[in-house]
């Protein structure tokens, strides 16, 4: 098993399928400039000027506010870009690497988005929502479909629903065939983990959203994070708990729009 | 052609306050962030505030904060910047220009009005 | 906020000469961006997104630079380079310029 710090940042959807086009509305991409504006990241619109994805997507060195744009939802990447400025990056001050944790971060739009029936925001979980195993979860993005294999032109945006997994059985699984003492955690509390040996985030799905229907209302429970390679014999995906970071995320983003 | 015409500079006593104005023309003036931009006589190019194209989001240098309000009136492709508690070091050609939607240099540039600020 | 601090404040050179202007940044920036005015003149975009050159400047100007370091080349100095060059940050607000470089002909 790779060793500590061998760990990857999520990347694509690993058995999956194009997600519906009417499903997902407030999945976004986030594009760093280049040659073209290319995809690195996902994210999720929790407000209409408010954007959610992963630290590592951006910090610990953030970039230039003219190095990034965001898009939102589009079935196919590249396809009809709308590309929106970002006025202010926010990582979370104790964010320093994803299996650290805090790996959480905010992205603020010049202008809010008008939104409609394809493009609104999701969202977030009051505080005493755990996400037990069992529950109806999804994830999303336009990253990896296998470990190191791209996701193929037109580049549409896929879904995988993946099982949730209790933190003390995920950490466990992490401890096998892995270099770190039984009692050092792995899957800390500020985390979640999804996902198996046939469904599970990838490289390129970094910050995108981790969603569950609770009650009839998607909920985002979690922030595509880090795991170690994708879809790996227990090795599932772990995802920043949003839960854990609404004081933080509330700080900054009115609770209603 | 592509233009920034700015005005209202003039003399103003200290503590006093101006409202300067910046007519676009030649571009589809909502579509575009923009921004002041100050130079003292003698001295170096100083960033005062920055608006949004649909004026969301603004920002202002720290010297300039809570004295200095920018805003904007899209249909009628003006930029303006309210200026009170003026002091001397206030003293300023005043500059407004236009932020590129691709690359965000400062592409476009006015020819600047004048504000001393003197008793 | 990010200091930029450009050196040297002023310098001359002689026609044919090369001359570098840096800009050094208080923190990293993604790009570092250059502007030149002349004496009663509004300042002009000369480069953008570290190396890429504004509509119109002569192709004897480069840009170069990462991180904390960047700096303004002129291969091969004309007379009319003569002028103040800024550079300018836009990592994050608050936006400020470097006090500029006085490029004098010798």
């Known amino acids: 098993a790779p060793a500590p710090g061998q760990a990857l940042q999520r990347v694509g959807i690993v058995g999956g399928q194009e997600a519906p086009r009417s499903k997902w509305p407030w999945q976004v991409s986030l594009r760093v400039h280049g040659p073209y504006w290319m995809h690195f990241c996902g994210g999720s619109l929790i407000h209409p000027q408010w954007v959610l994805t992963a630290a590592h997507c951006v910090g610990p060195d953030v970039k230039d506010l003219a190095a990034l744009r965001v898009q939102l939802r589009e079935q196919h990447l590249y396809y009809q870009d709308q590309l929106l400025p970002v006025s202010r990056i926010i990582v979370h001050p104790q964010f320093y690497t994803a299996q650290i944790g805090a790996d959480i971060a905010l992205l603020e739009l010049e202008e809010p988005v008008n939104v409609s029936s394809h493009v609104h925001t999701v969202t977030l979980p009051p505080a005493s929502e755990t996400f037990p195993p069992g529950m109806p979860c999804w994830v999303t993005g336009w990253g990896d479909v296998d470990n190191d294999e791209r996701l193929p032109p037109p580049f549409p945006l896929k879904q995988v629903k993946v099982p949730i997994m209790e933190n003390h059985i995920c950490d466990a699984k992490y401890h096998l065939g892995a270099y770190t003492g039984d009692d050092v955690r792995i899957v800390r509390d500020d985390m979640l983990c999804a996902g198996n040996t046939r469904r599970d985030s990838c490289q390129g799905d970094s910050g995108g959203p981790l969603v569950c229907k609770v009650n009839g209302t998607w909920l985002q429970a979690g922030v595509v994070s880090w795991g170690e390679g994708c879809a790996q014999p227990n090795r599932p995906g772990i995802y920043t708990r949003v839960t854990y970071y609404l004081d933080w995320i509330h700080h900054y983003v009115p609770k209603k729009p | 052609e592509v233009k920034l015409v700015e005005s209202g500079g003039g003399s103003v006593q200290p503590g006093g306050s101006r409202k300067l104005s910046c007519a676009a023309s030649g571009f589809t003036f909502s579509d575009y962030g923009m921004v002041w931009v100050r130079q003292a006589p003698g001295k170096g190019l100083e960033w005062v505030a920055f608006?949004?194209?649909?004026?969301?989001?603004?920002y202002y240098a720290d010297t300039m904060k809570g004295r200095f309000t920018i805003s904007r009136d899209n249909p009628k492709n003006t930029l303006f910047l309210q200026m009170s508690s003026l002091r001397s070091e206030d003293t300023a050609m005043y500059y407004c220009?236009?932020?590129?939607?691709?690359?965000?240099?400062?592409?476009?540039w006015g020819t600047g009005t004048t504000v001393t600020v003197s008793s | 906020q990010i200091v930029l601090t450009q050196s040297p404040a002023i310098m001359s050179a002689s026609p044919g000469e090369k001359v570098t202007i840096s800009c050094s940044a208080s923190s990293s920036v993604t790009y570092m961006y250059w502007y030149q005015q002349k004496p009663g003149s509004s300042p002009k975009p000369w480069i953008y997104?570290?190396?890429d050159l504004a509509s119109g400047v002569p192709a004897r100007f480069s840009g170069s630079g990462s991180g904390t370091s960047y700096s303004l080349t002129i291969s091969s100095m004309e007379a009319e380079d003569a002028a103040t060059y800024y550079c300018q940050h836009y990592h994050s607000y608050p936006l400020t310029f470097g006090a500029g470089t006085k490029l004098e002909l010798k």
């Open positions: 220009a236009r932020r590129d939607n691709y690359d965000w240099y400062f592409d476009v």
């Open positions: 997104r570290t190396s």
């Open positions: 608006i949004s194209s649909g004026s969301s989001t603004v």
